[in-house]
């Protein structure tokens, strides 16, 4: 089984644009990294800008769910 742990200090630059880095701990596979992106960014390393229209749609859905 695999689980997520926060990246070590020296691994944090895996993500750009202020994305939060996580490491997928998996005994059977090499370490993988994932990014939790800041609002306005997406992609494997948070490199992609989310168009404003999409951002507003996400906020609306979030409010509706609350």
């Amino acid at each position: 089984t695999s689980h997520l742990v926060k990246c070590a200090e020296k691994e944090k630059t895996f993500c750009v644009n202020g994305g939060e880095c996580f490491m997928v701990k998996d005994l059977s596979n090499p370490s993988r990294y994932l990014c939790k992106c800041q609002p306005g960014f997406t992609g494997a390393r948070c490199t992609e800008n989310v168009p404003m229209k999409v951002q507003n749609q996400e906020k609306a859905e979030e409010l509706y769910q609350k």
């Epitope: 630059t13 895996f14 750009v16 202020g18 992609e48």
Partner: antibody
Framework: EVQLVESGGGLVQPGGSLRLSCAAS????????IHWVRQAPGKGLEWVAA????????NYADSVKGRFTISADTSKNTAYLQMNSLRAEDTAVYYC?????????WGQGTLVTVSS | DIQMTQSPSSLSASVGDRVTITCRAS??????LAWYQQKPGKAPKLLIY???NLESGVPSRFSGSGSGTDFTLTISSLQPEDFATYYC?????????FGQGTKVEIK
């Protein structure tokens, strides 16, 4: 051992095209981030473009946007830089580099000269 | 785009000297700052990333510090093989941007 080998450089006339290749070995190509960086003769380093082979996302410097296209073929472990509408100011050594937490491995570079 | 400014642009030093190069970003880049060494006719080589993390295989005489907008590369005791040009690079956001370089020459 990680290795990056660039090829495809040469002399081209203004307005012409070239395709650079970056052949990679010694690491999981699909799991990395590939960048192209250039260096004009006697000048500093300039970031050009990047691709994440895993999801195909691409990014470009404003100076090359609309003229250059970065791509990757994961079956060949090779990244490409298609350069169109070349200008004299594109003359440089072009390096490809892998990025894990920074640009950790670099190729030897290939020289592109744009001149009539 | 984030502008990176290095100082000095060149310096002369002797073997054994302590050398300090500074790099300033035009806006906050947190700790996302890398340093590269380049020798004539060769590709750049990564020395430091994340402001202070020493790349594997790089001698411990190299060290980096700083966060936010102000960063420093220090060579504690300059060796003959350290005469080269050094570049800083912010890797906080795209486009990735480099400083103009600092050439370390023999006095």
């Amino acid at each position: 051992e990680v290795q990056l080998v660039e090829s495809g450089g040469g002399l081209v006339q203004p307005g012409g095209s070239l395709r650079l290749s970056c052949a990679a070995s010694g690491f999981t190509f699909s799991g990395t981030w590939i960048h192209w960086v250039r260096q004009a003769p006697g000048k500093g380093l300039e970031w050009v473009a990047a691709i994440t082979p895993a999801d195909g996302s691409t990014n470009y410097a404003d100076s090359v946007k609309g003229r250059f296209t970065i791509s990757a073929d994961t079956s060949k472990n090779t990244a490409y830089l298609q350069m169109n509408s070349l200008r004299a100011e594109d003359t440089a050594v072009y390096y490809c580099a892998t990025y894990m937490f920074a640009m950790d491995y670099w190729g030897q570079g290939t020289l592109v000269t744009v001149s009539s | 785009d984030i502008q990176m400014t290095q100082s000095p642009s060149s310096l002369s030093a002797s073997v054994g000297d302590r050398v300090t190069i500074t790099c300033r970003a035009s806006q906050d880049v947190k700790k996302s700052l890398a340093w590269y060494q380049q020798k004539p006719g060769k590709a750049p080589k990564l020395l430091i990333y994340g402001a202070s993390n020493l790349e594997s295989g790089v001698p411990s005489r190299f060290s980096g510090s700083g966060s936010g907008t102000d960063f420093t590369l220090t060579i504690s005791s300059l060796q003959p093989e350290d005469f080269a040009t050094y570049y800083c690079q912010q890797h906080y956001t795209l486009p990735l941007t480099f400083g103009q370089g600092t050439k370390v020459e023999i006095k």
